[in-house]
Amino acid sequence: DPVKPSRGPLVTCTCESPHCKGPTCRGAWCTVVLVREEGRHPQEHRGCGNLHRELCRGRPTEFVNHYCCDSHLCNHNVSLVLEATQPPSEQPGTDGQ
C-alpha cells in the first residue's frame, strides 16, 4: 500500500447496492443510479464514484438516470425518476379504440 499522490477531498456516502461491503462508502463523490432492465422494475443503487465523472452529466433516459453529488451523505434521500417513454405515434388506419 504505497503512499498515494494527493488528490481531491473524499466524501462519505450512503451505500445501498449488491456491491456494498458496508452501509457507507468513501469516494470522490456520491452517486445514485436508477436502472431499469428489460422486463424488470427499476432498481436504485446508491454508492461512491471515483471514475467516469462524465456519467454524472448524462441525461436521463427511459432506462437509466445517473445522479452525482459532492457532500457527505448527500445521496441518502435522493429519489430519481426515469424519462417517460414516448407514446407510440398513431398508426395510420387505426380507429383509436
Epitope: 473524499l10 461491503k21 452501509p23 462508502c25 468513501r26
Partner: antibody, heavy 120, light 107 residues
C-alpha cells in the same frame, strides 16, 4: 510499509489522565478513518472510539463517553486518545486501527498495542 | 446495541481438519460482518469483511458466509499457524460490537 505504532501507555492511578498516541506511516493517513479498540487482560475485544478521516465525526462506546476524547492531526499522521477520570475497568491493551479507504468501519491494519494499567 | 454471539467459545481440532465457527447477531446486519484472528500477545489480524470478502494477503483456506443474523467462518484445512482466537465483529451500526471469541486449540 504500512504501520501503526501506539505509545503513551503506562501505570496510572484511578481518577487520573493519560494520552495515547498512534503514529501512522506508509500510507495516506488523511484518507482513512481511525479507531481505538481495547482488550482487558484475558478478555475479548471492545471497540472504544472512532473518528472520520477528516476529523469531522467522532463516535464513542457508552463505557467511555464523556471521559475519553479521540482526535487526530493529519499534518502529523497521528491519532490520539485522551483518557480522563480513569477507572480500574479501563485497564487494557489499547490498539489503534485504520479502516479501508473505500469502506468506513472495515478495519484492515492494526497497531501492536500499548498497555494501560489503572491501579492505586 | 447489537449483540454478537459466537459459538463454540472454544474447540479442539487437529492439523488438516475443517473447522467452522459461527457468529449470530441479535438483529439483522445485512452482510456487514468482519472476522479477525488473534494470537497470544499479538494484535488482531483482519481476515474477512463484508461477510465473505478476503482481506488482501489472507490465504484462501479462510472463507466466510452468511447474511442477516447468521454467519460462519470456515478454515478448510487447519494448519499449525491457525491455532488462535477468532472474533467476529459487526459494523452495520454504532456502537461497533465484537463477538466473545472462539479459541481454536490443538487436539
Amino acid at each position: 510499509q504500512v504501520q501503526l505504532v501506539e505509545s503513551g501507555g503506562g501505570v496510572v492511578q484511578p481518577g487520573r489522565s493519560l494520552r495515547l498516541s498512534c503514529a501512522a506511516s506508509g500510507f495516506t493517513f488523511s484518507s482513512h478513518g481511525m479507531y481505538w479498540v481495547r482488550q482487558a487482560p484475558g478478555k475479548g475485544l471492545e471497540w472504544v472510539a472512532a473518528i472520520w478521516y477528516d476529523g469531522s465525526n467522532k463516535y464513542y462506546a457508552d463505557s467511555v463517553k464523556g471521559r475519553f476524547t479521540i482526535s487526530r492531526d493529519n499534518s502529523k499522521n497521528t491519532l490520539y486518545l485522551q483518557m480522563n477520570s480513569l477507572r480500574a475497568e479501563d485497564t487494557a491493551v489499547y490498539y489503534c486501527a485504520r479502516d479501508q479507504e473505500q469502506w468506513p468501519d472495515v478495519f484492515d491494519i492494526w497497531g501492536q498495542g500499548t498497555m494501560v494499567t489503572v491501579s492505586s | 446495541d447489537i449483540q454478537m454471539t459466537q459459538s463454540p467459545s472454544s474447540l479442539s481440532a487437529s492439523v488438516g481438519d475443517r473447522v467452522t465457527i459461527t457468529c449470530r447477531a441479535s438483529q439483522g446486519i445485512r452482510n456487514y460482518l468482519a472476522w479477525f484472528q488473534q494470537k497470544p500477545g499479538k494484535a488482531p489480524k483482519s481476515l474477512i469483511y463484508g461477510a465473505s470478502s478476503l482481506q488482501s494477503g489472507v490465504p484462501s483456506k479462510f472463507s466466510g458466509s452468511g447474511s442477516g443474523t447468521d454467519f460462519t467462518l470456515t478454515i478448510s484445512s487447519l494448519q499449525p499457524e491457525d491455532f488462535a482466537t477468532y472474533y467476529c465483529q459487526q459494523y452495520n451500526s454504532y456502537p461497533l460490537t465484537f463477538g466473545g471469541g472462539t479459541k481454536v486449540e490443538i487436539k
